[in-house]
Amino acid sequence: EVEKTACPSGKKAREIDESLIFYKKWELEACVDAALLATQMDRVNAIPFTYEQLDVLKHKLDELYPQGYPESVIQHLGYLFLKMSPEDIRKWNVTSLETLKALLEVNKGHEMSPQVATLIDRFVKGRGQLDKDTLDTLTAFYPGYLCSLSPEELSSVPPSSIWAVRPQDLDTCDPRQLDVLYPKARLAFQNMNGSEYFVKIQSFLGGAPTEDLKALSQQNVSMDLATFMKLRTDAVLPLTVAEVQKLLGPHVEGLKAEERHRPVRDWILRQRQDDLDTLGLGLQGGIPNGYLVLDLSMQEALS
């Protein structure tokens, strides 16, 4: 806490300008009017204040706005934003995407700090949903942003926003998140033709059910192995050898390299060995000929 001292004669700041870099901490505290600072915050970024001086300016704003800064001030915080605590930010009401962009720019190229996470949370809650422009902005700064949200939070993403999502934005999503995002993507891309649709939907297929995979197998999509390996195991298991062959097209040969990994391993265990043999890949572990394959769900129903 900077103790209150009178401003020396002739040093009262008439405007926020570079002359203030020559002021000591106590002089800034005594000679800079908080209301003047608030109206001229846009100048602060262009003045080479030391961080120690910025601490004083923050203190002055905190005193002026104990309930939280107005957006006109927030938009011009610049480096001062990094001096804010999550508690400070929770008091803010940020509604402008331009303000959000300005603050994200300060932290650009670095992992999401607690301040940024709090800011984004406040912004999204204020908007009520993750609209396309917001999602565009957030994923541009933080490609992993989408996958940091809970399935509950993702449920507020409107299908129209899915157009802003790039494949790399989904790299760290788990199956629960893709379960929520896939139906939205399916809806968003529903009017596209086959090959274009597949290109767009591909990154979301980790949330696709069996029936959608069966439908894709009829469309000559040539799914790559990397995408296949990310599919839900429970969605892959009911697929027939013929369906998998059609789904993967020329990439079917890649199954051999993945035969010990899920979901390929579990799928192999469900197939007849003679069906697997038709692939000519030497896949082993299928059900030997002559054995009865009982659908487990049927078995439970019979017992």
Partner: antibody, heavy 123, light 115 residues
Framework: QVQLQQSGPGLVTPSQTLSLTCAIS??????????WNWIRQSPSRGLEWLGR?????????DYAVSVKSRMSINPDTSKNQFSLQLNSVTPEDTAVYYC?????????????WGQGTTVTVSS | QPVLTQSSSLSASPGASASLTCTLR?????????IYWYQQKPGSPPQYLLN?????????GSGVPSRFSGSKDASANAGVLLISGLRSEDEADYYC?????????FGGGTQLTVL
């Protein structure tokens, strides 16, 4: 005439700590009107300001966001020098490192520079 | 988009003038910023030349000839370093810098060749 003389190793192993020192002659590290900066230069990143130390009734350090979590700058008043420590280095930290004085009267323009130390991060 | 953009190279003849520009990213108005200029020759550290905020607020480095001067081009949102009466010893890399949000930010540099 103010001079800055740098010292420190030219080769650092990945994940280790890079330590460099900048000895000041003709000015004081405790000056109330100067800041003491570290800057690095590499072909991929160009000139990059890393941080500074300065005395204004007590010592302060400011760091660039890019290195804040793994960098420290320490003044040594008895030897009139300041040092840089950069932890957990990677090949990306390979660069020429410079120390420089920022003068308040030049609005912290950096008017005096050390000779530079070429640091290679490699195993 | 970087905060400061400089054209990578420029060639000029001895005795002529060279104008080196330093463009600020859109959204950052050059108006209130002080632009600092440095010269660097191969194997040497950068050398402070001058800083420029306005015609009435500029500072030449100690011993820097008056052939080196600063200005701003508001329409291009840029700082400008003007070198008049070019000499062979002016052949070097030139860097602009600003203090932005209390951190020093450098441009990518312009390599000036004196033909």
């Amino acid at each position: 005439q103010v001079q800055l003389q740098q010292s420190g190793p030219g080769l650092v192993t990945p994940s280790q700590t890079l330590s460099l020192t900048c000895a000041i002659s003709g000015d004081s590290v405790s000056s109330n009107s100067a800041t003491w900066n570290w800057i690095r230069q590499s072909p991929s990143r160009g000139l990059e300001w890393l941080g500074r130390t300065y005395y204004r009734s007590k010592w302060y350090n400011d760091y660039a966001v890019s290195v804040k979590s793994r960098m420290s700058i320490n003044p040594d008043t008895s030897k009139n020098q300041f040092s840089l420590q950069l932890n957990s280095v990677t090949p990306e930290d390979t660069a020429v490192y410079y120390c420089a004085r920022g003068m308040m009267t030049y609005y912290y323009g950096m008017d005096v520079w050390g000779q530079g130390t070429t640091v290679t991060v490699s195993s | 988009q970087p905060v400061l953009t400089q054209s990578s190279s420029l060639s000029a003849s001895p005795g002529a003038s060279a104008s080196l520009t330093c463009t600020l990213r859109s959204g950052i108005n050059v108006g209130p910023y002080r632009i600092y200029w440095y010269q660097q020759k191969p194997g040497s550290p950068p050398q402070y030349l001058l800083n420029y905020k306005s015609d009435s607020d500029k500072q030449q480095g100690s011993g820097v000839p008056s052939r080196f001067s600063g200005s701003k081009d508001a329409s291009a949102n840029a700082g400008v370093l003007l070198i008049s009466g070019l000499r062979s010893e002016d052949e070097a890399d030139y860097y602009c810098m600003i203090w932005h949000s209390s951190a020093a930010v450098f441009g990518g540099g312009t390599q000036l060749t004196v033909l």
